[in-house]
Amino acid sequence: KETAFVEVVLFESSPSGDYTTYTTGLTGRFSRAGATLSAEGEIVQMHPLGLCNNNDEEDLYEYGWVGVVKLEQPELDPKPCLTVLGKAKRAVQRGATAVIFDVSENPEAIDQLNQGSEDPLKRPVVYVKGADAIKLMNIVNKQKVARARIQHRPPRQPTEYFDM
């Protein structure tokens, strides 16, 4: 369970057309459900019910986004449509380059994600909790375009990784 170093860059545009970037760093863990490798993409927040269906006729969302999923307390979500691992798989099927789970309210999900899988996903599946999860929630609450970069070693300089 290696540390995942996540950098989130918020892009805030001004009326003149210029934009400012704000970088926030947080840490999570790579789970055994996925690969321990770097990934980068625009953040797309996945509703717990938004990963339930599997309609063949669906238009696939563009590839290369980072899915963020907040898990609820198990007792408040007694009949989820998919397991946590199933949700990760569905997100990757739909084009996610990585999935980040906020497990703050469902720490049992960590064990589910770390059960040795014979067929782990080829994309990273990261979990965050506590203060790091709060940071992430605050970012997606800001309603600005945001990109996440997940690395398995500490970032050197944020500007090194983002082509502005």
Epitope: Q45, L49, E58, L76, P78, Q143
Partner: antibody, heavy 119, light 107 residues
Amino acid sequence: QVQLKESGPGLVQPSQTLSLTCTVSGFSFNYYNVHWLRQPPGKGLEWLGVIWSGGNRDYNSALKPRLRISRDTSKTQVFLTLNSLQTEDTGIYYCTRMWGYGYNPFDHWGQGVMVTVSS
Amino acid sequence: DIQMTQSPSFLSASLGDNITITCHASQDIKGWLAWYQQKSGNAPELLIYKASSLQSGVPSRFSGGGSGTEYVLTISNLQPDDIATYYCQLYHSFPFTFGSGTKLETK
């Protein structure tokens, strides 16, 4: 500031197709899911369907064969198409948004568009 | 599908009264309940979510409570601006069912 605005024809003939547009501003499809609901005259609210942040959709099972929801992210618009219209499809059609970080209610609504199905 | 049964359908009250509207779910919905207010000719507006959390900007005379299958919306010190129809709604599962509504009128 957050806005959702429905537009479309006020009158549609039976058996025809209804096409509505919801134009949104002040929030991102990356974080919010857009739902369609309707309200027959003098009656309660009925959920029709949703387009999730990832672009996939879910529909009310009773309407699924006739209903399609899509979007154009560049224009920040969501579309509803309902075919084989019947007089019972008359009502006010609303688009509304739902935050995707866990379970959340509909926190902003459009003002609605009245649709009458009549010959 | 989970059914939401709301009562009463009509409620007549005097300004200054405290009133209660109830919502019964056909199965345990774990508190994932919202209350909306709809004034004549307008779209619904969110009042309460997660059974008892007050939406930002909503006056504190509105409150929600309950758990399991039984939920209530209480309006304290009824004001003229509160005359509307109120709906409960579950939002943790399809098809996001609403109650049939309670139309509140003044005596």
